[in-house]
């Protein structure tokens, strides 16, 4: 099996943003995600 | 873009309570999330509290939940914060800010405009 290793020489932050869920539907209360690299994964 | 101007800061001694209002003009307020955020000297501005455009929907800072209370009034474009069982470390300068409808609410960013800020100070 290959072997793959992170060792990019850079720290890559996360950041949890939160987004009201009726910007987006109907539904109420806020939705939770988690920005890693710039990229929203969750 | 909407104008955004803080009151009700002041002196209160630890466990007391305030509350805060921030006044908007412009037409468009109720399509923008609002949120209150602190600034205690030398630190960076943090979040504290957000309130959907509508009113419906609320989300807290771990460190005031439970204690503080974010409201807003779409007839009389303002939103407030009652904040109770105040303490020292609730010191800061606050702000009221609008975000567009869409953005992260708990990041400084999101925000486009910003009132001047009013001054807690909780006295031990």
């Known amino acids: 099996d290959a072997e793959f290793r992170h060792d990019s020489g850079y720290e890559v932050h996360h950041q949890k943003l939160v987004f009201f869920a009726e910007d987006v539907g109907s539904n109420k209360g806020a939705i939770i995600g988690l920005m890693v690299g710039g990229v929203v994964i969750a | 873009e909407v104008q955004l101007v803080e009151s009700g800061g002041g002196l209160v001694q630890a466990g007391g309570s305030l509350r805060l209002s921030c006044a908007a003009s412009?037409?468009?307020?109720?399509?923008?999330?609002m949120g209150w955020f602190r600034q205690a000297p030398g630190k960076e501005r943090e979040f504290v509290a957000a309130v959907s455009r509508s009113g419906v929907s609320t989300y807290y800072a771990d460190s005031v939940k439970g204690r503080f209370t974010i409201s807003r009034d779409n007839a009389k474009n303002a939103v407030y914060l009652q904040m109770n069982s105040l303490k020292p470390e609730d010191t800061a300068i606050y702000y009221c800010?609008?975000?567009?409808?869409?953005?992260?609410?708990?990041?400084?960013?999101?925000?486009?405009?910003w009132g001047q800020g009013t001054q807690v100070t909780v006295s031990s």
């Open positions: 800010g609008a975000a567009y409808r869409g953005t992260a609410i708990n990041v400084r960013r999101s925000y486009d405009s």
């Open positions: 412009g037409r468009t307020f109720n399509n923008y999330n």
